[in-house]
Each structure stands twice: as C-alpha cells, then as structure tokens.
C-alpha cells in the first residue's frame, strides 16, 4: 500500500519537517524558519506559535513540532494548550474578581490556583478531628472518639500534610 501510495502521490514520501514543494516539481523541501510539519506528506508547513505577552516559551518550535507555551512567573495556564494565563495566589487564598482573597473560615486551599474548599467533616465518617484545619491545610481526621478509651496508648501522629498539588499544564 505504501509503495502504491508513493507511486500515485510523490508527496507521501516527504517526512515530517519537510513539505511537498509544488513550485519545485514536488520535491520535499525543509520547512522554512519558524514553521514546522509534524506529519509526513504535508503540502505546507504550519507557522510556529509565538509565546509572547503573558506567555513564555516552554518548548521551542522545531521543524517537526510546534512551540509550547506556559505562563510568565506568577501566573498559571488555563484551557487547552495553555490558552490563557491566570494570576497565582498564595496558598490559603483564592482568586476572585477582586483579586486574591483569603479563604473563609472552614475552607482551605493548598495550591496557588483554584478555589477554597471546605474542610473535611470528620464526623461524617464517624471520626474526630486530630489536627485542626487552617486556610492552607485540610483537617486531619483521627479515630472515632469511642476508639479512644481511657488510658489507651497515644495516637500515632498523622503523616505530614501533602505538598501542594501541581496540575499538569
């Protein structure tokens, strides 16, 4: 099939990083600067994305792959392919229309992005609060009060709070 295809269409032999140049008898020509072709058999090369303004270059454009952008420091990506940059806040805050605001009592945010979420309600699982929540950290639930009989050995300390999550960009 490949052989038949190439007999019928000489452009199918042009690899990624080149284009089939109609102006030169369908010779495979390299993509010009600032352009790329990520698949073979292309009749044109696509222009590279520019990472300007609030965007910065995460991966340079090559002859076979487009540039990839992320956001300048203090911002994080939103949308497909990092199509918008949103301001970071501190842990313990969320971004509102008025800027970064501290989480209300009873909520927390352990990341620089996203919204404040309510503390876990330990009693729903029949447990007690072992470590109080803060604006930056959820509560840590321990065994139920009934499990803590008088004179029982001390409770094993909780594992350290997890590091802030980082969403893939």
């Amino acid at each position: 099939f490949e052989r038949t295809r190439s007999l019928q269409d000489p452009c199918s032999n042009c690899p990624a990083g080149t284009f089939c140049d109609n102006n030169r008898n369908q010779i495979c020509s390299p993509c010009p600067p600032n352009s790329f072709s990520s698949a073979g058999g292309q009749r044109t090369c696509d222009i590279c994305r520019q990472c300007k303004g609030v965007f910065r270059t995460r991966k340079e454009c090559s002859s076979t792959s487009n540039a990839e952008c992320d956001c300048t420091p203090g911002f994080h990506c939103l949308g497909a392919g990092c199509s918008m940059c949103e301001q970071d806040c501190k842990q313990g805050q969320e971004l509102t229309k008025k800027g970064c605001k501290d989480c209300c009592f009873g909520t927390f945010n352990d990341q620089k992005r996203g919204i404040c979420r309510p503390w876990t309600n330990c009693s729903l699982d029949g447990k007690s609060v072992l470590v109080n929540g803060t604006k930056e950290r959820d509560v840590v639930c321990g065994p139920s009060p009934a499990d803590l009989s008088p004179g029982a050995s001390s409770v094993t300390p909780p594992a350290p709070a997890r590091e802030p999550g980082h969403s893939p960009q």
């Epitope: 949308g79 949103e86 229309k97």
Partner: antibody, heavy 115, light 107 residues
Framework: QVQLQQWGAGLLKPSETLSLTCAVY????????WSWIRQPPGKGLEWIGE???????DSNPSLKGRVTFSVDTSKNQFSLKLNSVTAADTAVYYC?????????WGQGTLVTVSS | EFVMTQSPATLSVSPGERATLSCRAS??????LAWYQQKPGQAPRLLIY???TRATGIPARFSGSGSGTEFTLTISSLQSEDFAVYYC?????????FGGGTKVEIK
C-alpha cells in the same frame, strides 16, 4: 472587580497627536500585559499594541511607528500616544487586559479626527 | 499576519433557535482562538477562549469548537440578550487579529 477606566481628548485635527490613558482598579497590575484596540465607526476591531508593568511593548506594524506606549505603575495606569493622526484614525479606542485573550475592557473613547 | 474571516456577515435567527457562526484562519492557529460578543455602544465581552473554554460567567448555551483553521461558535437557544455582533480573534501569532464580525439579528 477589575475595572478599566479610560479618558483622553475626543476631537483632534489632522497631524495632531492622540493621547489616551487607562487606569486599572481592582486586581493586580504587574505581570499582566495591557493593550489598546480600536474600532472605526461601524467596522471591526484592530489591535494597536500592548505594554506591561516594566515597560516592555509590542505594536501593530500597520501603525508604522506612529504609536508610543507608556506605563505608570505607581498609579496603575498606562497610556497611548498616536502621532500624525488623519481621518482614518477616527475610531472608538479601547484599553483591555491581555491574559491570552482580552478578558477585561475599558468603556471606550470615541476619538474623531476632523479639520 | 494571520487573516481571520467570519461568515456569514449577518445571521437572522428567531429567539429560541440555534445560531451557528463560523470563523476561518488563513493558517493553522491550533486552538488559540477567542470569541467576543459586542452590543451597540458597549465594549466587547469575552465569551470563549482556547476555542472551546467558556469564560467566567458565560452561560452554557454558548459553546465553541474547532481547531487548526476552522472554528465555530454555537448559541444553542438564542435569548433576546444574545442579539449582538460576535468577533473571533487569534492570539497564536502577533500582530493579534480579529475577524470582521457576524451580526446576529432577530428574524
């Protein structure tokens, strides 16, 4: 809420310099890029250019170097100057915040160039 | 520069009906496209970014699709407040460019 408020002279004669300022209220000023866009009466939108808090700029080549941007971070303001105006520069001029797309816009200022 | 072409120039639709607006880029822009709504005497308002992500506070009846060179904005059931002019804009490459707009009017 982030608000952009703009002002400047609304009536100019040919060859004069257009001057507009945009103030940003609420939210952060530094880190963002701040843009100017114009819209001739009854027509579409044209990007003029942009500036950030540290004064880094980019502009539309179609304006052939007639445009100057400036920023005053102490007041959270940025400005546009367009020199040697002609009737073709008559438009509503908007300031906007650039986060990739333009997510917040000023109210617009109609600038008329007439002799 | 990247040229953005919108069609149709005017779209006549009855309230409650579906509206489909098209935007074509002169070269591939991946999904780095925004849609705006503009009402008379007002500044444009961001509806969609990244070709398909609704901006904060935008009703679910607005949806965007497409990638490469062909893009669509769909308003599933037109409300009276949706009659306006809609613009697409690419921010894949500088200078930033807008389409000529599609006016959605009452049929």
């Amino acid at each position: 809420q982030v608000q952009l408020q703009q002002w400047g002279a609304g009536l100019l004669k040919p060859s004069e310099t257009l001057s507009l300022t945009c103030a940003v209220y609420g939210g952060s000023f530094s880190g963002y890029y701040w843009s100017w866009i114009r819209q001739p009466p009854g027509k579409g939108l044209e990007w003029i250019g942009e500036i950030n808090h540290s004064g880094s700029t980019d502009s539309n080549p179609s304006l052939k170097g007639r445009v100057t941007f400036s920023v005053d971070t102490s007041k959270n303001q940025f400005s546009l100057k367009l020199n040697s105006v002609t009737a073709a520069d008559t438009a509503v001029y908007y300031c906007a915040r650039l986060t990739g797309p333009f997510d917040y816009w000023g109210q617009g200022t109609l600038v008329t160039v007439s002799s | 520069e990247f040229v953005m072409t919108q069609s149709p120039a005017t779209l006549s639709v009855s309230p409650g009906e579906r509206a489909t607006l098209s935007c074509r880029a002169s070269q591939s822009i991946s999904s780095i496209l925004a849609w705006y709504q503009q009402k008379p005497g007002q500044a444009p308002r961001l509806l969609i970014y990244g070709a398909s992500t609704r901006a904060t506070g935008i009703p679910a009846r607005f949806s965007g699709s497409g990638s490469g060179t062909e893009f669509t904005l769909t308003i599933s059931s037109l409300q009276s407040e949706d009659f306006a002019v809609y613009y697409c804009q690419q921010y894949y490459n500088w200078p930033l460019t807008f389409g000529g707009g599609t006016k959605v009017e009452i049929k």
